[in-house]
Interface confidence: low
Amino acid sequence: EEELQMIQPEKLLLVTVGKTATLHCTVTSLLPVGPVLWFRGVGPGRELIYNQKEGHFPRVTTVSDLTKRNNMDFSIRISSITPADVGTYYCVKFRKGSPDDVEFKSGPGTEMALGAKPSAPVVLGPAARTTPEHTVSFTCESHGFSPRDITLKWFKNGNELSDFQTNVDPTGQSVAYSIRSTARVVLDPWDVRSQVICEVAHVTLQGDPLRGTANLSEAIRVPPTLEVTQQPMRVGNQVNVTCQVRKFYPQSLQLTWSENGNVCQRETASTLTENKDGTYNWTSWFLVNISDQRDDVVLTCQVKHDGQLAVSKRLALEVTVHQKDQSSDATP
């Protein structure tokens, strides 16, 4: 006959207050004859949790029918768990003896601990927008979990990030813990549509991590590029000039045209074209009146984007009496 083994498969059992906990115990042999009892703790002060033969255990039920002769499953369920129930539980085999049964073998024990799920991670980005190639910080917080062990990962568009620092508080024993992590993310020009994700994995979540997200569109400012061009066709004394404002984000944009230093047209960007990467394009048109008496006309397109310092691009129109429908190059 093989030697009796007492199998308690779970080293740790996490339970929630008010729920029912199942403590597993199976034996590999029916011999020696004698009962299996459950205790919390070890030594002389251990507490009897369940004895099928005697005592009153209103919160404990058995998983299997212990009266069957060939039963090898001595698992129990404890209902209405409270914080007072935490501890290590042992199933112990006794050998029939006279006058009292004698302890024969104990299982390795299952530690019952109170588990609490972490709250949904909240991700907060920077207070102000930053341009591409710069680094911004995102913080992620989750609270109220137990036990203390927890895993936090950061992702940007599905790619795992490595530049982050994480703290779990408090450092000592506590009923519940909090985690706070700060990730440093380098902004790319196409990040208008990007997301950062904070992923929290905890034993209470049973392999289904919680995620918090933040859109990089809230953190990024993509400054525009300007191009001023003269249209090749002239209509009478008028030349059409365009200022193409490309690849900017967010939408907020004011444009000013000036002719030889004199402001002559102001516009706020509307009816923008959205690019595939989430940035915007906009074109402003300006009609210049040209008379034969005017030799040089310098046009300036000035753009103020999202409250930042203005940027501008100039175009010198070389106008002569003989000029016919020709365009000029832009000057920086």
């Epitope: 940007k156 568009n157 599905g158 790619n159 795992e160 196409w190």
Partner: antibody, heavy 118, light 107 residues
Framework: EVQLVESGGGLVQPGGSLRLSCAAS????????MHWVRQPTGKGLEWVST???????YFPGSVKGRFTISRENAKNSLYLQMNSLRAGDTAVYYC????????????WGQGTMVTVSS | DIQMTQSPSSLSASVGDRVTITCRAS??????LAWFQQKPGKAPKSLIY???SLQSGVPSKFSGSGSGTDFTLTISSLQPEDFATYYC?????????FGQGTKLEIK
């Protein structure tokens, strides 16, 4: 390490079917568009199919109605079901990942050979 | 469908040379153009995306430029490992299409 590994290629008769698989690892598979591209021996590259993160699918006219693309995010797997195969479908089939939002094909598998011949 | 035309189809050059490969799209592709390098028996490798952005880990001797319909790939100083076939690809519009390839050989 970000990696794509194709499997399921082999010899099949004209009119037959084959299912290719692509196992992804090292990145969050569900966050990326995925593509199949093929290359007949000694020839250039040809885009075969795309599946978006929302399950939307795209095909060129040459395979539309014969090929289907699918993904199983829980298994980090991409599939290409090829029916009514023709000799012209003979090629090395690569799976590739679409880049972050931009959709450029940034990571490629090593390829699996499909031969359609009687 | 958008046609992608690469030139030249093949190119002989020496180590240390600067080479340029061009790619023309049959219509505007909004800079959604990628360049790939492929060596015999190997999978393509991404070099450039959105016409001029260098893929992570790719040496800076590779550069891309162009906009609208005309694009170029430049390799500033050829090394032995750069002899391969290069493909351009547009991903602005389905169906995605590739150029026919440019085979770069040692002179």
């Amino acid at each position: 390490e970000v990696q794509l590994v194709e499997s399921g290629g082999g010899l099949v008769q004209p009119g037959g079917s084959l299912r290719l698989s692509c196992a992804a690892s090292g990145f969050t598979f569900s966050s990326f568009d995925m593509h199949w591209v093929r290359q007949p021996t000694g020839k250039g590259l040809e885009w075969v199919s795309t599946i978006g993160i929302a399950g939307d699918t795209y095909f060129p006219g040459s395979v539309k109605g014969r090929f289907t693309i699918s993904r199983e995010n829980a298994k980090n797997s991409l599939y290409l079901q090829m029916n009514s195969l023709r000799a012209g479908d003979t090629a090395v089939y690569y799976c590739a990942r679409g880049g972050n939002w931009d959709d450029a094909l940034d990571i490629w598998g090593q390829g699996t050979m499909v031969t359609v011949s009687s | 469908d958008i046609q992608m035309t690469q030139s030249p189809s093949s190119l002989s050059a020496s180590v240390g040379d600067r080479v340029t490969i061009t790619c023309r799209a049959s219509q505007d592709i909004n800079n959604y153009l990628a360049w790939f390098q492929q060596k015999p028996g190997k999978a393509p490798k991404s070099l450039i995306y959105t016409a001029s952005s260098l893929q992570s880990g790719v040496p800076s001797k590779f550069s891309g430029s162009g906009s609208g319909t005309d694009f170029t790939l430049t390799i500033s100083s050829l090394q032995p490992e750069d002899f391969a076939t290069y493909y351009c690809q547009q991903y602005n519009t389905y169906p995605y299409t590739f150029g026919q390839g440019t085979k770069l050989e040692i002179k």
